[in-house]
């Protein structure tokens, strides 16, 4: 069966900035800002686009050791990100995969709303354990608030692209984003 759980949560961070940090650079940020939730993210294959496989490892004390995620869609224009949990964690005898959709929508107050859909694909007529749904939701909330705190404390990070002069780059003048300056990896 397919069990869909939808969540809406708000952030004070503008949509574009949050998408950059939380979605596009989450692999680098998460272990840094929320080491209690994620210990490492390893790129197994791909360059961040559809088909990319990542291994997310969790610290000791959490229910699962790791999960493998497959990137299905990255929409930079509409701030949409679709991915599936395909291995590890709760995936096993009763659960085939978890398809996740995240859309970040700008709000008039300058913040954003995250619309999250988690579809659990179970084998046969198995139900999804409540604790799996909770663990996933609470993990997402933990990561979001950690990234949000980081962005509030580092007002220059992940801002809109700015014109960097030739001297700064030691090369020709071009548009560059803040995370490129800090050698953050793009997906």
């Amino acid at each position: 069966g397919v069990f869909n759980y939808e969540t809406e949560t708000t952030s004070v961070i503008p949509a574009a900035r949050l998408f950059k940090a939380f979605i596009l650079d989450g692999d680098n940020l998460f272990p840094k800002v929320a080491p209690q939730a994620i210990s490492s993210v390893e790129n197994i294959e791909g360059n961040g686009g559809p088909g990319t496989i990542k291994k997310i490892s969790f610290p000791e004390g959490l229910p699962f050791k790791y999960v493998k995620d497959r990137v299905d869609e990255v929409d930079h224009t509409n701030f949409k990100y679709n991915y599936a949990v395909i291995e590890g964690g709760p995936i096993g005898d009763t659960l085939e995969k978890i398809s996740n959709e995240i859309k970040i929508v700008a709000t008039p107050d300058g913040g954003s709303i995250l619309k999250i859909s988690n579809k659990y694909h179970t084998k046969g007529d198995h139900e999804v354990k409540a604790e799996q749904v909770k663990a996933s939701k609470e993990m997402g909330e933990t990561l979001l608030r950690a990234v949000e705190s980081y962005l509030l404390a580092h007002s220059d990070a992940y801002n809109e692209q700015k014109l960097i002069s030739e001297e700064d780059l030691g090369g020709e003048q071009k548009l560059i984003s803040e995370e490129d300056l800090h050698h953050h990896h793009h997906h």
């Epitope: 959490l62 007529d125 139900e127 999804v128 409540a130 604790e131 799996q132 749904v133 909770k134 608030r145």
Partner: antibody
Framework: QVQLQESGPGLVKPSQTLSLTCTVS??????????WSWIRQQPGKGLEWIGY???????YYNPTLESRVSISVDTFKNQFSLMLHSVTVADTAVYYC?????????????????WGQGTTVTVSS | DIQLTQSPPFLSASVGDRVTITCWAS??????LAWYQQNPGKSPKLLIY???TLHTGVPSRFSGSGSGTEFTLTISSLQPEDFATFYC?????????FGPGTKVDIK
């Protein structure tokens, strides 16, 4: 010891919004891993789980009510609230707030170990 | 959704009797089951969780057993304050549901 007390109007008109508050005393609503629930009991009927919320605001709802229900938390007042929109006479019930019993297994719920005394809400014009 | 059924719906018994109530789940819920007692005009009270663990302060005459789809609540020697309605509840998946209840009254 944690105690819960529901409050709110006892009479609501059809199509309006039912709004109830549960005040937590004897403990902090912000305790890690605590979840706070709403349950109702229609006259002469059994119990129905409405949904619950964590101290940080993540919510989980019964799909049968999800389109009409909203649960929120106010950590400063040590309260959590229920809003049920577009009520009908079928929403007439005793509404209980309750604390979820957590155990050794993280994120696993074991039952509702502390209950409020319940508040009767009648939907009538 | 997982459905729970209880048997019997009504039960007449005397003080001192041994009483057994059964709860069936529509699918395997492992041990994710709780039992409650509700006296008339009162809030439900948690008796048993995790199918067989007695909640703090609950008298030892109450016991729970079972796993998977069939569970029982047993009262070894019925006391006057035990005349009430008993509900089972699963906590396996969302939404959590309750059984329809078993009303125990005085014979």
């Amino acid at each position: 010891q944690v105690q819960l007390q529901e409050s709110g109007p006892g009479l609501v008109k059809p199509s309006q919004t039912l709004s109830l508050t549960c005040t937590v005393s004897g403990g902090s609503i912000s305790s890690a891993d605590h979840y706070w629930s709403w349950i109702r009991q229609q006259p002469g009927k059994g119990l129905e789980w409405i949904g619950y919320i964590s101290y940080r605001g993540t919510t989980y709802y019964n799909p049968t009510l999800e389109s009409r229900v909203s649960i929120s938390v106010d950590t400063f007042k040590n309260q959590f609230s229920l809003m049920l929109h577009s009520v009908t006479v079928a929403d007439t019930a005793v509404y209980y707030c309750a604390k979820v019993l957590q155990g050794l297994v993280r994120f696993r719920d074991y039952g509702f170990d502390v209950w409020g005394q319940g508040t009767t809400v009648t939907v009538s014009s | 959704d997982i459905q729970l059924t209880q048997s019997p719906p009504f039960l007449s018994a005397s003080v001192g009797d041994r009483v057994t109530i059964t709860c069936w789940a529509s699918q395997d819920i492992s041990s994710y089951l709780a039992w409650y007692q509700q006296n008339p005009g009162k809030s439900p009270k948690l008796l048993i969780y995790d199918a067989f663990t007695l909640h703090t302060g609950v008298p030892s005459r109450f016991s729970g057993s079972g796993s998977g789809t069939e569970f029982t609540l047993t009262i070894s020697s019925l006391q006057p304050e035990d005349f009430a309605t008993f509900y089972c509840q699963h906590l396996y998946s969302f939404p959590f549901t309750f059984g329809p209840g078993t009303k125990v009254d005085i014979k």
